[in-house]
């Protein structure tokens, strides 16, 4: 399955929007910094077949979409930017979903892919717990925004590598 060219443009737009969403200086939130243990090894693109990589990317975007679709998120960000960001993620989800279905049809997830999906889920669990512990403070959201920018950059790079493999 070839992801449409608009997909990579959507990735870039999502990153730009997320950058624009920053409301407070990252430096004023240094005390709140946290290592969420992003599962880099799941995004290096070496141990995967393309199909499996797309499933993991889908999980990544889906969890990001869910994180920014909460009431707490709505209260934290400028509404029009948040809506545009969510729209970009939703479009990416549609592209990836179509690819997962096209590549293998609806079937059981390959065993080697199961732990990668769980690793992504656990990463977002750590982010969710951090926000809860910090009572969704502005600095906590700023730390999370910066973290998601980093993880989306990894996703974008993996997708570039997948396109080069084609």
């Amino acid at each position: 399955c070839d992801l449409p060219q608009t997909h990579s443009l959507g990735n870039r737009r999502a990153l730009i929007l997320l950058a624009q969403m920053g409301r407070i200086s990252h430096f004023s939130c240094l005390k709140d910094r946290h290592d969420f243990g992003f599962p880099e090894e799941e995004f290096d693109g070496h141990q995967f077949q393309k199909t499996q990589a797309i499933s993991v990317l889908h999980e990544m975007i889906q969890q990001t979409f869910n994180l920014f679709s909460t009431e707490d998120s709505s209260a934290a960000w400028e509404q029009s930017l948040l809506e545009k960001f969510s729209t970009e993620l939703y479009q990416q989800l549609n592209d990836l979903e179509a690819c997962v279905i096209q590549e293998v049809g609806v079937e059981e997830t390959p065993l080697m892919n199961v732990d990668s999906i769980l690793a992504v889920r656990k990463y977002f669990q750590r982010i969710t717990l951090y926000l809860t512990e910090k009572k969704y403070s502005p600095c906590a959201w700023e730390v999370v925004r910066a973290e998601i920018m980093r993880s989306l950059s990894f996703s974008t790079n993996l997708q570039k590598r997948l396109r080069r493999k084609d």
Epitope: H58, Q62, Q63, N66, S69, E97, L118, Q125, L129, T132
Partner: antibody, heavy 119, light 108 residues
Framework: QVQLVQSGAEVKKPGASVKVSCKAS????????MHWVRQAPGQGLEWMGE????????IYAQKFQGRVTMTRDTSTSTVYMELSSLRSEDTAVYYC????????????WGQGTLVTVSS | EIVLTQSPATLSLSPGERATLSCSAG???????LYWYQQKPGQAPRLLIY???NLASGIPARFSGSGSGTDFTLTISSLEPEDFAVYYC?????????FGQGTKLEIK
């Protein structure tokens, strides 16, 4: 509010198959994995597997591999769990439970569907 | 597979007393992925505590959770009549996800 409504009780003969449905409402159906958990009479809870309603990919517990099939219909926001080659030990209440994160993990359950396997 | 063993199987106490329920894991479970559920007869399980020690929405403060590694505890500080039920610990730290066999909390 989030609601998961399951199909009614079933009685099946050994060797037959059963298909239980779980209709979701009150949230975006394709955003969350749906899990199936069963409970034999007087026994504990047992995780069977999960399905991503967005693209339909599944993850099954090894114990049920080859006998369980989870599917979904996005047009009706419904997930299905089919169990084949039924035996008496499969007599249980089958629950669907919605995934999520933090306080949302298995925070929402269907009411349960009793499947009785008897000759 | 991570086996969760709950003890005791049955706990007989009176309202007002303190209840301590244990959950022992066969191998280490990250505390972020250890949950507790309450189940009453004829009902679906209900989320009580998530990530070892966090109270789910609407759960009274008399419930608390603690632990790490392989040993986890659910404590009910002062039992109310509605607390008598079966309690399950659950992990989703690794596949397959598992539940303990349950502790039945009954009125003495």
């Amino acid at each position: 509010q989030v609601q998961l409504v399951q199909s009614g009780a079933e009685v099946k003969k050994p060797g037959a198959s059963v298909k239980v449905s779980c209709k979701a409402s009150g949230y975006t159906f394709t955003n969350y994995w749906m899990h199936w958990v069963r409970q034999a009479p007087g026994q504990g809870l047992e995780w069977m597997g999960e399905i991503n309603p967005s693209h339909g990919r599944t993850i099954y517990a090894q114990k049920f591999q080859g006998r369980v099939t989870m599917t979904r219909d996005t047009s009706t926001s419904t997930v299905y769990m089919e169990l084949s080659s039924l035996r008496s030990e499969d007599t249980a209440v089958y629950y669907c439970a919605r995934g999520g994160l933090g306080p949302a993990w298995f925070a929402y359950w269907g009411q349960g569907t009793l499947v009785t396997v008897s000759s | 597979e991570i086996v969760l063993t709950q003890s005791p199987a049955t706990l007989s106490l009176s309202p007002g007393e303190r209840a301590t329920l244990s959950c022992s894991a066969g191998s280490s479970v990250d505390s972020s992925y250890l949950y507790w559920y309450q189940q009453k007869p004829g009902q679906a399980p209900r989320l009580l505590i998530y990530s070892t020690s966090n109270l789910a929405s609407g759960i009274p403060a008399r419930f608390s959770g603690s632990g790490s590694g392989t040993d986890f505890t659910l404590t009910i500080s002062s039992l109310e009549p509605e607390d008598f039920a079966v309690y399950y610990c659950h992990q989703w730290s690794s596949y397959p996800f598992t539940f303990g066999q349950g502790t039945k909390l009954e009125i003495k």
